[in-house]
Interface confidence: medium
């Protein structure tokens, strides 16, 4: 089965600074996303062989690739105390398949030493199970998906 | 209850604008990529553009680039699609789907609408 591996598993980086994260896989990609899931879900890049990549407008003029679709490094320029959170590739073949995650920890230089990452990588149950029903995704990317709220969550 | 209800739709002349929305109730909007697409008579359903969950990104058919704008107000659960220097071969029946967490260039759609009828013609 097709796997995406992703590193670093965590980094801590103060502001202004820029941060590497890999996505590999075995290739037969139709392409690749880097999302960052959490409380605002947000697609921050799709690239694909031979196409323009797609930026989000939070991150243009801040990305950089380099490599291919297979093995791809997404470099992250001039980060912002509001990037810390969990970067996710997603390999988007005939299932879509998840990374690991990476952590990035965007603190002020001077508060570096108190926020270190740790070793473990993170952990599959930050990125719970989806709904069921009929807007069930593929079953082979249910562990890596976050559930939806409900619809009293809303504003 | 998971419903999409598009507004919006009408006659206008080509060159004229129009102004679809696609309002979502029972689920939160936030978590879900939204496209839109339109079908003509006798023909089968095509794309027409997506935007992500957060609005940051977007893509468009070639066919509409340039000339039509997606965007997305959360808070208010609706998407929108800006339709400016309309075609007849615009004319058509739009939906507007939804995907959780989904793909801009691979969208399949979760949640349908049941369409509004656009028609461009003098």
């Known amino acids: 089965a097709q796997e995406v591996q992703q590193s670093p598993h965590c980094t801590t980086v103060p502001v202004g600074a820029s941060v590497n994260i890999t996505c590999s896989t075995s290739g037969g990609l139709r392409g690749i996303y880097l999302r960052q899931l959490g409380p605002q879900p947000q697609d921050i890049i799709y690239y694909e062989d031979g196409v323009v990549p797609t930026t989000d407008r939070r991150f243009r003029g801040r990305i950089d690739f380099s490599g291919s679709q297979d093995n791809l490094t997404i470099t992250m320029h001039r980060l912002q105390l509001s990037d810390t959170g969990t970067y996710t590739c997603q390999a988007i073949t005939e299932v879509n398949v998840y990374g690991s995650g990476t952590l990035v920890l965007v603190t002020e230089e001077q508060s570096q030493g108190w926020h270190r990452c740790s070793d473990a990588p993170p952990r599959a149950s930050a990125l719970p199970a989806p709904p069921t029903g009929s807007a069930l995704p593929d079953p082979q990317t249910a562990s890596a998906l976050p559930d939806p709220p409900a619809a009293s969550a809303l504003p | 209850q998971v419903q999409l209800q598009e507004s919006g739709g009408g006659l206008v002349q080509p060159g004229g604008s129009l102004r679809l929305s696609c309002t979502a109730s029972g689920l939160t909007l936030g978590y879900y990529a939204i496209g839109w697409f339109r079908q003509a008579p006798g023909k089968e359903r095509e794309f027409v553009s997506t935007i992500s969950a957060s609005g940051g990104m977007t893509y468009y058919a070639d066919s509409v680039k340039g000339r039509f704008t997606i965007s997305r107000d959360n808070a208010k659960n609706t998407v929108y699609l800006e339709m400016n220097s309309l075609k007849p071969e615009d004319t058509a029946v739009y939906y507007c789907?939804?995907?959780?967490?989904?793909?801009?260039?691979?969208?399949?759609?979760?949640?349908w609408g049941k369409g509004t009828q656009v028609t461009v013609s003098s």
């Open positions: 789907a939804a995907e959780y967490l989904g793909n801009l260039r691979h969208f399949r759609g979760d949640h």
